[in-house]
């Protein structure tokens, strides 16, 4: 069964790992919820700025006068320099971003909302954003996610139960109901048939198909041979013989005219049995102990 979740960067925690909204899917990733880390060669709060050109950016945009900037490249609006849905328009020397409501800055990368506005719901902790020139990040409590901790987490959507286990979100905890042959809090242990399994009361473990079965000693039954069996329940005595439970099995008291451990042999009128004679010391009709 192929599903595998290493306990990495909170993936088995209460919320799925989701990067900050706007983090570039091409050049950004995250290891903590709400952050945006850039792959090599990219920079900026949302990893949308190539490193090779970031040194060329003055407050008014790319400047050919900047030392070391040898990348005239394509037009200034190519590569979508405006973040957060801002629209780019070229100017004689650079570009200009027209930002949507709530965002500003050279590339619309700054959110106008601050921690003072209380943007984090459900007890989320607001970090940064002390003034309008810095963005904020909400660190969500267990059970919530989203850029503002506005969304309750379906923790089972993280698929924490391995080997086909059924995930149950009990509110206070997650529980995995494991398929036969698997165990552990996340169904991570393959019981490997009989390995580590004992059958009680002298029972023998029989392997087969990823599960185990106990072949129980006489007088015992159940999945692990822990239940004392009633040997007479199956009516083992033939031809009207009466069954008596015995510490080592059962005893059949045969009806007249029958003999054998289970009263299975008719006694001929001349006294000879149809099949093997009664064991020494037993007369036809005597109780037969079945061992």
């Amino acid at each position: 069964y192929p599903y595998d979740v290493p306990d990495y960067a909170g993936m088995l925690g209460s919320a799925p790992l989701v990067c900050r909204a706007g983090c570039s899917p091409e050049h950004g990733f995250c290891e903590q919820p709400g952050e945006c880390r850039c792959l090599e060669g990219w920079t900026g709060p949302l990893c949308t700025v190539p490193v090779s050109t970031s040194s060329c950016l003055s407050p008014r945009g790319p400047s050919s006068a900047t030392t070391g900037c040898l990348v005239p490249g394509p037009g200034p609006c190519d590569g979508n320099p405006c973040a957060n849905g801002g629209s780019c328009s070229e100017t004689p020397r650079s570009f200009e971003c027209t930002c949507p409501r709530g965002f500003y800055g050279l590339r619309c990368e700054v959110s106008g909302v601050t921690c003072a506005d209380g943007p984090c719901f459900n007890g989320g902790l607001c970090v940064g954003g002390a003034d309008p020139d810095s963005a904020y990040i909400c660190h969500c409590p267990p059970g919530f996610q989203g850029s503002n901790c506005e969304k309750r987490v379906d923790r089972c959507s993280l698929q924490p139960c391995r080997n086909g286990g059924l995930c149950l979100d009990l509110g206070h905890a997650l529980r995995c109901r494991c398929r036969a042959g698997f165990a552990g809090p996340r169904c991570e242990h393959d019981l490997d048939d009989c390995a580590g399994r004992a059958c009680a009361n002298g029972g023998t473990c029989v392997e087969g198909g990823g599960a185990h079965r106990c072949s129980c000693a006489l007088g015992f039954g159940g999945r692990d041979c822990r239940e004392r069996a009633d040997p007479c329940a199956a009516r083992p005595c033939a031809h009207g013989g009466r069954c008596y439970a015995h510490f080592s099995g059962l005893v059949c008291a045969c009806a007249p005219g029958y003999m054998g451990a289970r009263c299975e042999f008719p006694v001929h009128p001349d006294g000879a049995s149809a099949l093997p004679a009664a064991p020494p010391g037993l007369r036809p009709g005597d109780p037969q102990r079945y061992l």
Epitope: P2, Y3, D4, V5, P6, Y8, M11, P16, L17, V18, C19, A21, G22, C23, S24, P25, E26, H27, G28, F29, C30, E31, P33, R37, L39, E40, N84, G85, P100, Q145, G146, S147, N148, E150, K151, V153, D154, S157, L158, Q159
Partner: antibody, heavy 120, light 107 residues
Amino acid sequence: QITLKESGPTLVKPTQTLTLTCTFSGFSLSTRGVGVGWIRQPPGKALEWLALIYWNDDKRYSPSLQTRLTITKDTPKNQVVLTMTNMDPVDTATYYCARSNWGNWYFALWGRGTLVTVSS
Amino acid sequence: EIVLTQSPATLSLSPGERATLSCRASQSVSSYLAWYQQKPGQAPRLLIYDAFYRATGIPARFSGSGSGTDFTLTISSLEPEDFAVYYCQHRSNWPITFGQGTRLEIK
């Protein structure tokens, strides 16, 4: 320049196992944060996400198909392999591989796709 | 599993017109929704991510809006090359799912 290319059989018989390989260039699965996924599209139908694997060997599978899917990576060869067991005619589709970054579960860069037909 | 429902299934418009495509989620996905464009015989291309951020190289006529459960992709003035199938996809939690698509065709 980043490229991804899918390869594998074009015709598979029912009950057989499909093995598809995604060979990529321009990035490495040893780079922190990088992953590769598989998406399929039956003829004339919608896209369906199948599986993802990341640089740290974390694997994600579509719940409806996870018992049939296995995704692995060969980092030195720049390859990701998807196997799908017990193929059925309804699995006939174009299979795409695409790059996806950790925590940013979108698909920014795609291969051209390979059509797999399941028929006896 | 979050189900994404796109509407309309088919939209017939002329070049120069404004196109409005809708994607509705069965539960909130915050702003974690993307739009892809797919032309016949080609792989999908990422247009918009996290509801309204344009991907690299995407023209300004494409814009996205919405949050929670209702999202819109708008093409302000249709160009001939914009006629294609458009899909939405969320990244809110597992499993990742796509919408069934909206076909934008020439009227």
